[in-house]
Interface confidence: medium
């Protein structure tokens, strides 16, 4: 008869470092002591007729245990395979590039240390929860890679590495370990340089706006902008609208920057840089300065007008170029009232880097003259009908403008410039006096008032009434006579005898 030696449990699965209770039993009635052969740490827990129980401790790796016993002089054996599973000690996703260009590939790398059995261990690379790659864990440490094409949607996306130890066939479930996620930052930086709008010339101590724009930038909000005039960094205001970035600054040139300079705009994103440069000439152009001997002179005074500009400039004064052509021009004049308010304009032209720069300055001359009262602006004789509406006009001229008063008998004023009803007391001779800091002039003005004569009016009215009454009566009598004649004629034609001619009532 053939006897068996059973080992229980059969082909167990346990976690690394665990312990296992093993029972060896035989149905051989005359068996000797049962032995357990294993490289693992073992301890006999109990034994009896045809059986023995052992405890295996600190089981770290897969192993085969063998029980043996002598039965009737023959050795019989039984075995069991122990499968040890262990979760990985380390699952690490390698750092991602600090910035990844959109449209270019990057490599995800995951390293897994430990984990058994390897045949049941899978490494999964993920973007969010999307599987990018699923590979078996091969070597120790297992190193798994996947190539990913970076897109705009990947900006800010978390990537991670997951291990799956599938012990489901052994009834133990799926053990998952996940690495710390790593966030990707993707970017688009166009190959074209920024558009830089800057002046070609900039005068010392003047300011001008500078604009730098770059389109097709992603994410525009993450870009760094550097704007500079020479080595002087400009304080830029950066705005982004969609994929367009605009930096605006004000460039102010200093005296020590005179000459050929560059305005630079750098846009940096993802460790890459795009640069635009524009040449700029910083120049100093003082003047032109217009000088009058005195800005305010009295009539008849000689005035010198001088114009002076940058030593390399060419000036024209009131349209007349300097003789010889150069940075200075002047003219002489005797001040007349017509020169009051006259502008003296000096234009200077300076050549800067092949370009002509123009500047102007204008000064006004004030000529003090007067006062004046002449016939044209202040007539000496006015004749107005009584009760009519009139506005007495008298304009005094001079600089400064004179104060004008017209008085009759030194007390009664003529209301200059005001509308008045002409009365007899307005009549008379007025003395008009114009006074300013430049002196005083007087002029006599006579006002005549025409009064109507009433007897002429009455005669005229009576005569008109008589004439009109006579004309009316004559017309009436003529018409009556005509009608009577017509009636008589009609009666005669009918054969009716005529009655004596009596006064008929008018029809």
């Amino acid at each position: 008869q053939e006897f068996l030696l059973r080992v229980e449990p059969q082909n167990p699965v346990l976690s690394a470092g665990g312990s296992l209770f093993v029972n060896c039993s035989t149905d051989c009635p005359s068996s000797e002591k049962i032995a357990l052969e294993t490289s693992l740490s073992k301890e006999l827990v109990a034994s009896g007729m045809g059986w023995a129980a052992f405890n295996l401790s600190n089981v770290t790796g897969n192993s085969r245990i063998l029980c043996s016993v002598y039965c009737n002089g023959s050795q019989i054996t039984g075995s069991s395979n122990i499968t040890v599973y262990g979760l990985p000690e380390r699952v690490e996703l390698a750092p991602l590039p600090p910035w990844q260009p959109v449209g270019q590939n990057f490599t995800l790398r995951c390293q897994v240390e430990g984990g058994s059995p390897r045949t049941s261990l899978t490494v999964v690379l993920l973007r969010w929860e999307e599987e990018l790659s699923r590979q078996p864990a091969v070597e120790e440490p297992a190193e798994v890679t996947a190539t990913v094409l970076a897109s705009r949607d990947d900006h800010g996306a978390p990537f991670s590495c997951r291990t799956e130890l599938d012990m489901q066939p052994q009834g133990l479930g799926l053990f998952v370990n996940t690495s710390a996620p790593r966030q990707l930052r993707t970017f688009v930086l166009p190959v074209t340089p920024p558009r830089l709008v800057a002046p070609r010339f900039l005068e010392v101590e003047t300011s001008w706006p500078v604009d730098c724009t770059l389109d097709g930038l992603f994410p525009a909000s993450e870009a760094q902008v550097y704007l500079a005039l020479g080595d002087q960094m400009l304080n830029a205001t950066v705005m982004n609208h969609g994929d367009t970035l605009t930096a605006t600054a004000t460039a102010t040139a200093r005296a020590d920057q005179e000459g050929a300079r560059e305005i630079v705009c750098n846009v940096t994103l993802g460790g890459e840089r795009r640069e635009a440069r524009e040449n700029l000439t910083v120049f100093s152009f003082l003047g032109p300065i217009v000088n009058l001997t005195k800005p305010e002179v009295s009539e008849g005074t000689e005035v010198t007008v001088k114009c002076e500009a940058h030593p390399r400039a060419k000036v024209t004064l009131n349209g007349v170029p300097a003789q010889p052509l150069g940075p200075r021009a002047q003219l002489l004049l005797k001040a007349t009232p017509e020169d009051n308010g006259r502008s003296f304009s000096c234009s200077a032209t300076l050549e800067v880097a092949g370009q002509l720069i123009h500047k102007n300055q204008t000064r006004e001359l004030r000529v003090l003259y007067g006062p004046r009262l002449d016939e044209r602006d202040c007539p000496g004789n006015w004749t107005w009908p009584e009760n009519s509406q009139q506005t007495p006009m008298c304009q005094a001229w001079g600089n400064p403008l004179p104060e004008l008063k017209c008085l009759k008998d030194g007390t009664f004023p003529l209301p200059i410039g005001e509308s008045v009803t002409v009365t007899r007391d307005l009549e008379g001779t007025y003395l008009c006096r114009a006074r300013s800091t430049q002196g005083e002039v007087t002029r006599k003005v006579t006002v005549n008032v025409l009064s109507p004569r009433y007897e002429i009016v009455i005669i005229t009215v009576v005569a008109a009434a008589v004439i009109m009454g006579t004309a009316g009566l004559s017309t009436y009598l003529y018409n009556r006579q005509r009608k009577i004649k017509k009636y008589r004629l009609q009666q005669a034609q009918k054969g009716t005898p005529m009655k004596p001619n009596t006064q008929a009532t008018p029809p």
């Epitope: 390698a94 490599t107 790398r109 390293q111 390897r118 045949t119 590979q135 078996p136 091969v138 070597e139 120790e140 440490p141 190193e143 798994v144 890679t145």
Partner: antibody, heavy 119, light 112 residues
Amino acid sequence: EIQLQQTGPELVKPGASVKISCKASGYSFTDCIILWVKQSHGKGLEWIGKINPYFGTTTYNLKFKGKATLTVDKSSSTAHMQLNSLTSEDSAVYYCARKEAYPDAMDYWGQGTSVTVSS
Amino acid sequence: DAVMTQTPLSLPVSLGDQASISCRSSQSLVHSNGDTYLHWYLQKPGQSPQLLIYKVSNRFSGVPDRFSGSGSGTDFTLKLSRVEAEDLGVYFCSQSTHVPYTFGGGTKLEIK
């Protein structure tokens, strides 16, 4: 063009050390694993070990553990192998080669560095 | 370690002939992931080894189609359909399924 350029021949005394370099070009250095192989007249080709330039992790053939030390300098895309306590048994031609991260084949090899250990 | 045994040690051929080299492993080269990491290299005189075939039967880029690989488990073969002068040198098989990676002793292909 993918290339692995090794340093020139070395003549060293017994007991000394030698450091061989392998400069990679034409590909992303951290994307592939660098392996080292010994070729001696008596024993043919022997695999010494490998290093992952990205992680810096190494795996050695137990026969060469303590004899060879593998390192990389990512900034210069160069792999190094230092051989210590040299004896005449270490006289050989040493090759560097590269392979993908998966256990694939060594697709590109350096030209080899001859090391002669002699007093 | 997986011991790789190549036969023959030397293979004299005439140009245009067919050639066959055998490689046997002391253990199966089938990885737990199902792939078999058995590769063939050629070392021409005075040069470094160069890859011909990877994972049993895949020709590396630039390798002529007169080279072919076959086999499974522990037995593998490299065949050359028509030997040319540039094919002369020492052929090695190698495995990377198990650590340490190991090489065969080499087969010298020479002109008769």
